[in-house]
């Protein structure tokens, strides 16, 4: 159904192979990515309220697909931004909660409950919103828009408690 407005291969924005996305735009895509659909010649990425397409063989397309497959994008993305300089300290453990998020929309009540449920968090840049955690289990939240099924992904149901800490020799490096 390539070309169908309501089908999974409708493109809101097509990115040419000649001009791949900037680092900043890729970070935005990583954060808001909800799903992808393999079409005949291109891949369509569904974000929260819009879509973008790129050629199947474009490196950035394969990178984003891989990122979502490994649950390193979208619901789970920690939101590192380029040129970050300041890092928040990890918060003290309080209780146990699930990792993952079902939406980019966080109400104040959700944010408060998130804070109360948090155990130690990964270190995040100031001003960034971690979408590592939400209130739903996997497959509970499914939003249908224009014929597309957007559900909480694998990361949304991470039963494992929150990250203990950042680890590794390069764990506190700044920009990607």
């Amino acid at each position: 159904n390539e070309g169908s407005v309501t089908g999974s291969c409708y493109c809101g924005k097509r990115i040419s192979s000649d001009s791949p996305p900037s680092v900043q735009f890729m970070n935005r895509l990583r954060k808001h990515l909800r799903a992808y659909h393999r079409c005949l010649y291109y891949t369509r990425f569904q974000l929260l309220s819009w879509s973008v397409c790129g050629g199947n063989k474009d490196p950035w397309v394969q990178e984003l697909m891989s990122c979502l497959d490994l649950k390193e994008c979208g619901h789970a993305y920690s939101g590192i931004v380029a040129h970050q300089k300041h890092l928040l300290p990890t918060s003290p453990p309080i209780s146990q909660a699930s990792e993952g998020a079902s939406s980019d929309i966080h109400t104040p009540a959700q944010m408060l409950l998130s804070t109360l449920q948090s155990t130690q968090r990964p270190t995040l840049p100031v001003g960034s919103l971690s979408s590592d955690k939400e209130l739903t289990r996997p497959n509970e939240t499914t939003i249908h828009t224009a014929g597309h099924s957007l559900a909480a992904g694998p990361e949304a149901g991470e039963n494992q408690k929150q990250p203990e800490k950042n680890a590794g020799p390069t764990a506190r490096t700044s920009a990607t």
Partner: antibody, heavy 118, light 113 residues
């Protein structure tokens, strides 16, 4: 060819420490989600720990049985993952496998044996 | 945690027969973001590390004989070994990687009569 080579296992007394290493090659290490899985002799497989990629702050996750005692880290510049194991218990005795989760599959090393005994 | 229930625990078949191993998860492993099932199958022979046979529930790992196939979606999955050979004697495990912690089935021991 993808390779994961674990090292650092050995015999240690209860309460002691060991640091396991996992040297990777044959794939883009920085894009892989790394995990440790262990297997006691004659038993099934048990997930131990996970570390995410740089864009996600190298966030780490641990099985309840090792939380607070084990620390997972990675050095993307050296294509190596590490598992620091402190306050070891006899029940930590197992073969420890390093795994790399990529879109092309989940790769496993040959394992390194950790024996905790007095 | 997602519970993986594997059956049978063990089975003995004659060479050339077809083996079917079942794996059931306590919740769906199908991710709507990519329509993939986060399930893998492994073969483990004595003294060896687990060998990946199948990932994404049905994708055969490179180098794995085509007599091994995976099927299923959601919560019910099957590993089929058609025309079992002597070298297939091993323990087979299913594993979900949809969620942390990764969890494994209890294993199915396959023997040749």
């Amino acid at each position: 060819e993808v390779q994961l080579v674990e090292s650092g296992g050995g015999l240690v007394q209860p309460g002691g420490s060991l640091k396991l290493s996992c040297a990777a090659s044959g794939f883009t290490f920085s894009n892989a989600v790394m995990n440790w899985v262990r297997q006691a002799s004659g038993k099934g497989l048990e997930w131990v720990a996970r570390i995410r990629t740089k864009p996600n702050n190298y966030a780490t996750f641990y099985a309840d049985s090792v939380k607070g005692r084990f620390t997972f880290s990675r050095d993307d510049s050296k294509n190596t993952a590490y598992l620091q194991m402190n306050s070891l218990k006899t029940e930590d005795t197992a073969m420890y496998y390093c795994t790399a989760w990529t879109t092309e599959g989940i790769y496993w090393g040959q394992g390194t044996l950790v024996t905790v005994s007095s | 945690d997602i519970v993986m229930t594997q059956s049978p625990d063990s089975l003995a078949v004659s060479a050339g027969e077809t083996v079917t191993i079942n794996c059931k998860s306590s919740q769906s492993l199908l991710y709507s973001g990519n329509q993939k099932n986060y399930l893998a199958w492994y073969q483990q022979k004595p003294g060896q590390s687990p060998k990946l046979l199948i990932y994404w529930a049905s994708t055969r790992q490179s180098g794995v004989p085509d007599r091994f196939s995976g099927s299923g979606s959601g919560t019910d999955f099957t590993l089929t070994i058609s025309s079992v050979q002597a070298e297939d004697v091993a323990v087979y495990y299913c594993q979900q990687y949809y969620d942390t912690p990764w969890t494994f089935g209890g294993g199915t021991k396959v023997e040749i009569k």
